[in-house]
Amino acid sequence: ARNGDRCPLGPGRCCRLHTVHASLEDLGWADWVLSPREVQVTMCIGACPSQFREANMHAQIKMNLHRLKPDTVPAPCCVPASYNPMVLIQKTDTGVSLQTYDDLLAKDCHCV
Amino acid sequence: ARNGDRCPLGPGRCCRLHTVHASLEDLGWADWVLSPREVQVTMCIGACPSQFREANMHAQIKMNLHRLKPDTVPAPCCVPASYNPMVLIQKTDTGVSLQTYDDLLAKDCHCV
């Protein structure tokens, strides 16, 4: 049976959404983004043990083959299942504009 | 400038499509799949160095933060960008049926 969201490695060890506080300098954006100067970056971090938040059939296959051939096939990886949009205010040749991004901040996570 | 598909680690070391030969037993499907008995599983394997096949802005952020905080933020991960469908012949309660899977075999890869 799939254990879905229960982490067998202990609380907080498995694939989940984390928030990392970052400045524009950290992100390498200081030259072209005016605002905000700080971003609460949400990203997917953590281990992907068997059956934990498996995204699809491919993830199941990958885990099974990883157990058989760990040197050849890596374990599934914790990545965004969907994203939260964000608007940045940027410098442009003509002045200042709003720039919209659909794929900047992770919204939830799964194992692929 | 983005280096896109050129692997700075040497040929074949970066995120790309690999084929792994697997039996139904390897996949854990022997109980419910009749055919095929062997599958050429295509999956995404390899390193994700800076700017290599970055899927989106999130991948760029993740790489920048990984360089700053390698113990906290992992590097981007090599995962399928799209999938090839596959048809399996399965046992069912009523006999045998064709079952199509859209998310079984990786078609191409990127870093997220």
């Epitope: 005016l34 964000m86 608007v87 | -």
Partner: antibody, heavy 120, light 107 residues
Framework: QVQLVQSGAEVKKPGATVKVSCKAS????????IHWVRQAPGQGLEWMGW????????VYAQKLQGRVTMTTDTSTSTAYMELRSLRSDDTAVYYC?????????????WGQGTLVTVSS | DIQMTQSPSSVSASVGDRVTITCRAS??????LAWYQQKPGKAPKLLIY???SLQSGVPSRFSGSGSGTDFTLTISSLQPEDFATYYC?????????FGGGTKVEIK
């Protein structure tokens, strides 16, 4: 918590200048831009412009261009909005609002508002 | 400039009712829409950003949906404190523009 506190109500004569202040606390002032919005009595909300304390870059609404100036003082974490050549139709409550942490074009939190009355 | 049209301009409802307010943009704005609540004599309060993301601290009875040009704010079960005026605002491009507002009144 994040707070924006605005200066008190003002009564001005037509042709005069008003300067409204907005003091920020509870966050790093130059990390987020400030928007200014006004609301005439019984009317809806009208966006006036935006400023980032970090660089002083501004964007103004076209209809106010030439009459409005937005500035910041990072030493006191205060934003200012100056409106010149006041007319009776500038009578409104003037609000400052910080960029939302999630997206720069959503506004929140807001200051409590400053009523500016233009009357001869 | 992008024009924002809200409807209805006012709605009478009772506590417990489901209330829906719509907002239409004059051109596509993807998901870049915010909703605000304003009570008399008070500053507006951000409820929803990016069309459907609930601002921290806002009750879950408020929800937003839509994309492109048509958007909806829904209050699933109206509470006494929800009687107020609601505004939509596009955040896709400068100048930012607001809808005309929808007053939710007690029936």
């Amino acid at each position: 918590q994040v707070q924006l506190v605005q200066s008190g109500a003002e009564v001005k004569k037509p042709g005069a200048t008003v300067k409204v202040s907005c003091k920020a606390s509870g966050y790093t002032f130059d990390s987020y831009g400030i928007h200014w919005v006004r609301q005439a009595p019984g009317q809806g909300l009208e966006w006036m412009g935006w400023i980032t304390a970090y660089s002083g870059d501004t964007v103004y609404a076209q209809k106010l261009q030439g009459r409005v100036t937005m500035t910041t003082d990072t030493s006191t974490s205060t934003a200012y909005m100056e409106l010149r050549s006041l007319r009776s139709d500038d009578t409104a409550v003037y609000y400052c609002a910080r960029e939302s942490g999630q997206t720069s074009s959503a506004l929140g939190p807001w200051g409590q508002g400053t009523l500016v009355t233009v009357s001869s | 400039d992008i024009q924002m049209t809200q409807s209805p301009s006012s709605v009478s409802a009772s506590v417990g009712d489901r209330v829906t307010i719509t907002c239409r943009a004059s051109q596509g704005i993807s998901r870049w829409l915010a909703w605000y609540q304003q009570k008399p004599g008070k500053a507006p309060k951000l409820l929803i950003y990016a069309a459907s993301s609930l601002q921290s601290g806002v009750p879950s009875r408020f929800s937003g949906s839509g994309s492109g040009t048509d958007f909806t704010l829904t209050i699933s079960s109206l509470q006494p404190e929800d009687f107020a005026t609601y505004y939509c605002q596009q955040g896709a491009s400068f100048p930012l523009t607001f809808g005309g507002g929808t007053k939710v009144e007690i029936k």
